[in-house]
């Protein structure tokens, strides 16, 4: 899987679009994990509605909100009041029995609040090649590694 | 019990080189990034570089770029690196160290270390 | 490369004092700084990932902040075995860069 980049700004809330084939998923719910690690496993933050039909409804688990599109086949993620620690290397999944497929490999970049002048010295605007060599940019403040790509550096 | 063995002591001359191996056990070492970080006496720790031993993809810090070539054998589990052109500065603890990765890898762990002396 | 500066390089404190040691970074890495003790002639021992979470196993006592490029370990109340080196290593970029290292000495 490739992994896209979305960037935030620190306070504010952070959408992220998954999209997938509604068909080859039709009737199976939705989560979205965070990953320890580029190979350690994904813990599940927040999943969709216990009954597919109502996976429009949306769910929070915190500042963190899911919300399916199953017709359209779009999964969103709202990340609200984004903090420094929210940054990482995240999941959208698509639940079948105890097995998850992975529908998008997302990471989560946090810059800082352009506004917020305690930080004024310390203000990020990273490059294209800031987290991932090469990485194509999207113009949805989100970008994708290509293929072959690994995400960068493999911390702890 | 998981862990990180690496082999014993080594006393090599300048301009040799030198394979020094990294045997894992309890975990299999393609679920994880394999390091390598050296420290000579008394000076700090140095970063040489990273192997994925799931593809064999490997990267080195541009100090070791040509020098150092770290590889792994997934059949027994096992992670090498080799420095070759043996300098004196080259004498260290030589530690193998295994991550998941970047972003927040809860996985943590570390050989015993392994002196390498150059002296001629 | 990105410059990992530590300080103080050294410090002397008595058992029971709250300790507190800065890192700061050339260029902004997020959070993706780790903390290391080291002991003589022991290997590294990783304390905090990603600026502020404790890993498994390392006591309540230690405690990391920061993001960006400023970023601090403290000990809340120095218990005897603290006594070693401490490295702070960052994890935006490679070649991953390591902190000069700590030492804290027994006053």
């Known amino acids: 899987h490739n992994t896209t980049v979305f960037q935030g700004v620190a306070g504010q809330s952070l959408q992220v679009s998954c999209p997938y084939d509604s068909m080859k998923h039709w009737g199976r719910r939705k989560a979205w994990c965070r990953q320890l690690g580029e190979k350690g496993p994904c813990q599940r933050v927040v999943s969709t509605h216990n009954l597919w039909l109502l996976s429009f409804l949306r769910r929070w688990n915190g500042s963190t909100a899911i919300t399916d599109d199953t017709l359209g086949g779009t999964l969103t993620i709202t990340l609200r009041n984004l903090q420094p620690h929210d940054a990482g290397l995240y999941q959208c999944q698509s639940l079948h029995g105890s097995e998850a497929d992975t529908l998008r490999k997302v990471l989560v970049e946090v810059l800082a609040d352009p506004l917020d002048h305690r930080d004024a010295g310390d203000l990020w605007f990273p490059g294209e090649s800031e987290s991932f060599e090469d990485a194509h940019v999207e113009h949805s403040i989100s970008r994708s590694l290509l293929e072959g790509e690994i995400p960068f550096p493999p911390t702890s | 019990q998981v862990q990180l063995v690496q082999s014993g002591a080594e006393v090599k001359k300048p301009g040799a080189s030198v394979k020094v191996s990294c045997k894992a056990s309890g975990f299999s070492i393609e679920d994880f990034y394999i390091h390598w970080v050296r420290q000579a006496p008394g000076q700090g720790l140095e970063w040489m570089g990273w192997i994925d031993p799931e593809n064999g993809e490997s990267k080195y810090a541009p100090k070791f770029q040509g020098r150092a070539t770290i590889t792994a054998d997934t059949s027994t589990s096992t992670a090498y690196m080799e420095l070759s052109s043996l300098r004196s500065e080259d004498t260290a603890v030589y530690y193998c160290h295994a991550d998941h990765g970047n972003y927040g890898s809860t996985m943590d762990y570390w050989g015993q270390g392994t002196l390498v002396t150059v002296s001629s | 490369d990105i410059q990992m500066t530590q300080s103080p390089s050294s410090l002397s404190a008595s058992v029971g004092d709250r300790v507190t040691i800065t890192c700061h970074a050339s260029?902004?890495?997020?959070?993706?700084l780790s903390w290391y003790q080291q002991k003589p002639g022991k290997a590294p021992k990783l304390l905090i990932y990603k600026a502020s979470n404790l890993h498994t196993g390392v006591p309540s006592r230690f405690s990391g902040s920061g993001s960006g490029t400023d970023f601090t370990l403290t000990i809340s109340s120095l218990q005897p075995e603290d006594f070693a080196t401490y490295y702070c290593?960052?994890?935006?970029?490679?070649?991953?860069?390591f902190g000069q290292g700590t030492k804290v000495e027994i006053k």
């Open positions: 290593q960052q994890g935006q970029t490679y070649p991953r860069t």
């Open positions: 260029q902004h890495i997020n959070v993706w």
